[in-house]
């Protein structure tokens, strides 16, 4: 016969799970802030840049009170997946000038991927319905010039910073309701 069954698996404390997710999100927010500052130092922005393919900011700070955990986690995961795709695109197609932001951009990508896995785990631990697999997103066109890569980087890091800031606030608020 096989080995004796182990002790029954204790369901982890969802507040502790949420805590570790908040820590990861905070850490990624700090990384993003630092990389955005590095980008500004090397390539000062010549405008307030945005990119149509980026997700719109999920929620204003004032509307945080109405949030529900499933909705927040599902939306956060979808938005961060989009940012992961954009960071990958930036590293691949952003041009030689953005190579000066390595290895930090690579580290950011790895930590973003780690946070996404943590969110997936949290959703399954909380027995939240798993969202359907994302439809394949249309490929992002490469920037038309070196300046295009720089402006895209400003847009992506700026948007990711706002999203993560929103995520930290939202997750902390939801923790108090668990």
């Amino acid at each position: 016969p096989g080995p004796p069954p182990g002790p029954p698996r204790v369901s982890p404390d969802p507040r502790a799970e949420l805590d570790s997710t908040v820590l990861l999100t905070r850490s990624l927010l700090a990384d993003t802030r630092q990389l955005a500052a590095q980008l500004r130092d090397k390539f000062p922005a010549d405008g307030d840049h945005n990119l149509d393919s980026l997700p719109t900011l999920a929620m204003s700070a004032g509307a945080l009170g109405a949030l529900q955990l499933p909705g927040v986690l599902t939306r956060l995961r979808a938005d961060l997946l989009s940012y992961l795709r954009h960071v990958q695109w930036l590293r691949r197609a952003g041009g030689s000038s953005l190579k000066t932001l390595e290895p930090e951009l690579g580290t950011l990508q790895a930590r973003l991927d780690r946070l996404l896995r943590r969110l997936q785990l949290l959703m399954s631990r909380l027995a939240l319905p798993q969202p359907p697999p994302d439809p394949p997103a249309p490929p992002l066109a490469p920037p038309s010039s070196a300046w295009g890569g720089i402006r895209a980087a400003h847009a992506i890091l700026g948007g990711l910073h706002l999203t993560l800031d929103w995520a930290v606030r939202g997750l902390l608020l939801l923790k108090t309701r668990l």
């Epitope: 000062p44 405008g47 000038s97």
Partner: antibody
Amino acid sequence: EVKLLESGGGLVQPGGSLKLSCAASGFDFRRYWMSWVRQAPGKGLEWIGQINPDSSMINYTPSLKDKFIISRDNAKNTLYLQMSEVRSEDTALYYCATYGHHATDSWGQGTSVTVSS
Amino acid sequence: DIVLTQSPASLAVSLGQRATISCRASESVDSYGNSFMHWYQQKPGQPPKLLIYRASNLESGIPARFSGSGSRTDFTLTINPVEADDVATYYCQQSNEDPFTFGSGTKLEIK
């Protein structure tokens, strides 16, 4: 107040070289893109090129790329334009300028370069 | 390179009237939520002075008589009403792509 003071211009023979300088003051030089723009007598403005704060990205107008070299020394708050193989069509007033959130928003008074034998 | 075509080459306007200068780009200068078209004024013996940045933003210290509009390839600088001090040459410039380029200039005179 932003101040940009170009120097180094003068008379140079065809085929010769010249190095222009632009001394910057009144702002944090190391946080700005810097540009060179020239203007031939009685003509319009021609963008020469630009350099980012840490010199990792330098762009030129293609026709001048092999003749001109843009550089900067952040410790000295100075922008440079090294000109080589000059010809009569390089006779112009050479301006240095900042480039940033408000486009090319500060210009020097210019330094005059005359190419003649 | 992006070619900027300015028109007219020269313009004579009565004091108090409206002056309109056009700048057409050979390809779009819009990207990342901005129109990278700027307008400068240059008086004889002086360096250029920024009037309008990114198509429609008035530079600090510039009178509200100056305004800019347009997107993609077609842009306009309007001066209304024209004053004697506005006699100058006006240039458009695109900074969407390297090399940045200038229009050929429009000389404004008083009728």
